[in-house]
Interface confidence: medium
């Protein structure tokens, strides 16, 4: 039904999340999410993942820099809110963004391997 | 925040169970009562895969496993013997069990540790 997530996915506040335990490059992560009919995590706010705010891990999220728009964009083309990561102005625009669920973000080479989070909206 | 599904609001669903992921610390007994008041049980771990998942979500929490003393066996809340290895079991003061980064350990029941609750759908 509309309120069920697929097996091995976490359901929270009408969203489904796949939290990987494997480490992949940013591009590999993006393709893996797409193959599951989802996309790399797009955050609405920094408490979206507060159910795992004690996690020690950083995860690739669906944020990349667009030279064309000179802005950090989510996979759906929307722009990053300046309030989400106050330090985003210091991010290296050649890098990809890894996120820790207690609100920290860092920029790392997109070829580095990290865990990743895919997200599906239920409704 | 929108609410959807079969679990209480602000709980998570995973593999046909609902989980309350606590942020507050309690003793083992207080945690037991807190989960009971939420119509659920102190976290039980059914398999290795579930343990890995929970370790990703939260590095440590009480689980519903205890013993009366170091001379007694580890048991679950429904009185069944708990078969999985619990580290540091030789310490007579540590009679309640904790999930800690992919392994189970014994701890002092009066310690304040984060707790999670679970109920199966």
């Amino acid at each position: 039904d509309c309120c069920s997530c697929q097996e091995k996915w976490v359901g929270y506040r009408c969203n489904c999340y796949f939290i990987s335990s494997e480490q992949k490059t940013w591009n590999e992560s993006r393709h893996l999410c797409a193959s599951q009919k989802s996309s790399l995590l797009q955050l609405q706010n920094t408490d979206e993942l507060d159910f795992m705010s004690s996690s020690q891990q950083f995860y690739w999220i669906g944020l990349s820099y667009s030279e064309e728009h000179t802005a950090w964009l989510w996979e759906n083309g929307s722009a990053l809110s300046q309030y989400l990561f106050p330090s985003f102005e210091t991010f290296n625009t050649k890098n990809c963004i890894a996120y820790n669920p207690n609100g920290n973000a860092l920029d790392e080479s997109c070829e580095d391997k990290n865990r990743y989070i895919c997200k599906q909206q239920l409704i | 925040a929108r609410h959807c599904g079969h679990c209480p609001e602000e709980w998570i669903t995973y593999s046909n169970s609902c989980y309350y992921i606590g942020k507050e610390r309690r003793t083992w007994e207080e945690s037991l009562l807190a989960c009971t008041s939420k119509n659920s049980s102190l976290l039980s771990i059914d398999n290795e895969e579930e343990m890995k998942f929970l370790s990703i979500i939260s590095p440590s929490s009480w689980i519903g496993v205890f013993r009366n003393s170091s001379h007694h066996p580890w048991v679950t809340m429904n009185g069944l013997a708990f078969k999985h290895e619990i580290k540091d079991s030789d310490n007579a003061e540590l009679n309640c069990a904790v999930l800690q980064v992919n392994r189970l350990k014994s701890a002092q029941c009066g310690s304040s540790i984060i707790y999670h609750c679970k109920h199966k759908l």
Epitope: Q23, F58, N102, G103, N104 | R25, S58, P59, S60
Partner: antibody
Framework: QVQLVESGGGVVQPGRSLRLSCAAS????????MHWVRQTPGRGLEWLTF????????YHADSVKGRFTISRDNSKNTLFLQMNSLRAEDTAVYYC????????????WGRGTLVTVSS | EIVLTQSPATLSLSPGERATLSCRAS??????LAWYQQKPGQAPRLLIY???NRATGIPARFSGSGSGTDFTLTISSLEPEDFAVYYC????????FGQGTKVEIK
């Protein structure tokens, strides 16, 4: 007893390297994430770097990123800090510290080792 | 980064008196704040974590309170061994420390 003991400090010239070690005893080292923290009279306590219990996650402060690397050998109960391209401002007492179970607080510290960067 | 500002820099009190130390964060850290005690020549020692929980073996005269941006460490009745430097530390966003408050004998 439960303790952490740092070693490897000393006087080193700017631009050179140094490797600090931290020997853990009295607890199951492989269960705990670890940190390095340094202290100077001018800047106080400064967190430097973190490593998860199994070594799979490492984070570094901007002030040392690209120069300092944290690592661990769980079979030897030892934490390391490789410090390259040292600068005068790296002069400090360096502490290793154990991370509390559920992350973020330093519940056990070593006595510290002094690193002096001077020509 | 989150900046923690401690006040006062120095607190001069006599044994038996009550000590109140303040720590203010530049942005909310929820309750993710700890207090440490450091004596000369020694490493810091964890006193309080998550704003108000006493660490193992810490006497009841030490208590912590606060959430968000304003936190307090209270020592209800100073013992001779309590004269030291006290630091606050947050873990809400990476890890940062306050500059310390020295509690000295009056």
């Amino acid at each position: 007893q439960v303790q952490l003991v740092e070693s490897g400090g000393g006087v080193v010239q700017p631009g050179r390297s140094l490797r600090l070690s931290c020997a853990a005893s009295g607890f199951t080292f492989s269960d705990y994430a670890m940190h390095w923290v340094r202290q100077t009279p001018g800047r106080g306590l400064e967190w430097l770097t973190f490593i998860s219990y199994d070594g799979s996650n490492k984070y570094h402060a901007d002030s040392v990123k690209g120069r300092f690397t944290i690592s661990r050998d769980n079979s030897k109960n030892t934490l390391f800090l490789q410090m390259n391209s040292l600068r005068a401002e790296d002069t400090a007492v360096y502490y290793c510290a154990r991370d509390s179970w559920d992350r973020g607080y330093f519940d056990l510290w070593g006595r510290g080792t002094l690193v002096t960067v001077s020509s | 980064e989150i900046v923690l500002t401690q006040s006062p820099a120095t607190l001069s009190l006599s044994p038996g008196e009550r000590a109140t130390l303040s720590c203010r964060a530049s942005q909310s850290v929820s309750s993710y704040l700890a207090w440490y005690q450091q004596k000369p020549g020694q490493a810091p020692r964890l006193l309080i974590y998550d704003a108000s929980n006493r660490a193992t073996g810490i006497p009841a005269r030490f208590s912590g309170s606060g959430s968000g941006t304003d936190f307090t460490l209270t020592i209800s009745s100073l013992e001779p061994e309590d004269f030291a430097v006290y630091y606050c530390q947050q873990r809400s966003n990476w890890w940062t420390f306050g500059q310390g408050t020295k509690v000295e004998i009056k």
